[in-house]
Amino acid sequence: CKAMHVAQPAVVLASSRGIASFVCEYASPGKATEVRVTVLRQADSQVTEVCAATYMMGNELTFLDDSICTGTSSGNQVNLTIQGLRAMDTGLYICKVELMYPPPYYLGIGNGTQIYVIDPEPCPDSDF
């Protein structure tokens, strides 16, 4: 089958600081040297791009400075971290992987990770 399979966890719970991490793993049909990873958020029928990064195999994954994502890569595995999440950001986060170079191009789309974000309760005022 000329296709690329992408695996990611079904569910992740963000930390109380609004940080969620998950692994996106892809089974590469070819020997790619340039890979693009995109995180998409699907809410209802709306899809938005959360962040994206292109990296050379063996090099670090670099997102734009103002991105809410950071990540590291190791072989066919990408460790993604999304920060600054709030309860309203709860949703399905889909990992999209593209083998950009050399040809042929391959597209791989994961089934998505449902990220649950719970806003922390405000600390009650303390009387000292």
């Epitope: 995109t38 998409l40 999209k96 191009y105 597209l107």
Partner: antibody, heavy 118, light 108 residues
Amino acid sequence: QVQLVESGGGVVQPGRSLRLSCAASGFTFSSFGMHWVRQAPGKGLEWVAVTWYNGRNKYYADSVKGRFTISRDISKSTLYLQMNSLRVEDTAIYYCARGGYYGAFDIWGQGTMVTVSS
Amino acid sequence: EIVLTQSPGTLSLSPGERATLSCRASQSVSSSYLAWYQQKPGQAPRLLIYGTSSRATGIPDRFSGSGSGTDFTLTISRLEPEDFAVYYCQQYGTSPWTFGQGTKVEIK
């Protein structure tokens, strides 16, 4: 709204050149792969070329490789197709299309007709 | 390259009838990367279905897609007058991107 508008088509002699443009609006141009697809009169759809996000990676159909060049100007949100050494069999309507988030071609322009004839 | 073969070439049906269009791939295609398009005379193609079975924005639910491996199907449950057109399948999981030759759905 999200829109693609092609221009630059016309009648040209075999061996000559033509440059097509596709002006994009209503979306972040740099976030999508952009394709050219053509359709010869009375025939089906044929994928021609694609350029990716930063414009560095490009792929071509074997039928146009070495003759056509795809490019994009992100500052102008415009896609181009430079067609050299045109042949009679290149006669077609040329469409630009956006590769959507999930890969399918979700937005299409109205098309521009290219006729190669002596 | 992955060759897509559509059948039948032409489908003659009446409004209200069910249309079943077939798309067969020369090698296995992941169901995530199979799309269907509709094209009316003088118009650009329009995305109907992506990922084999997901309807694109604004597409009515009388259109549905199914299949896996090498065999895929587009079904129009009850043909409306505006559904008479040419339909193309496409694979977009690997380069080169390829289309089927099309199936024309015409009024009987």
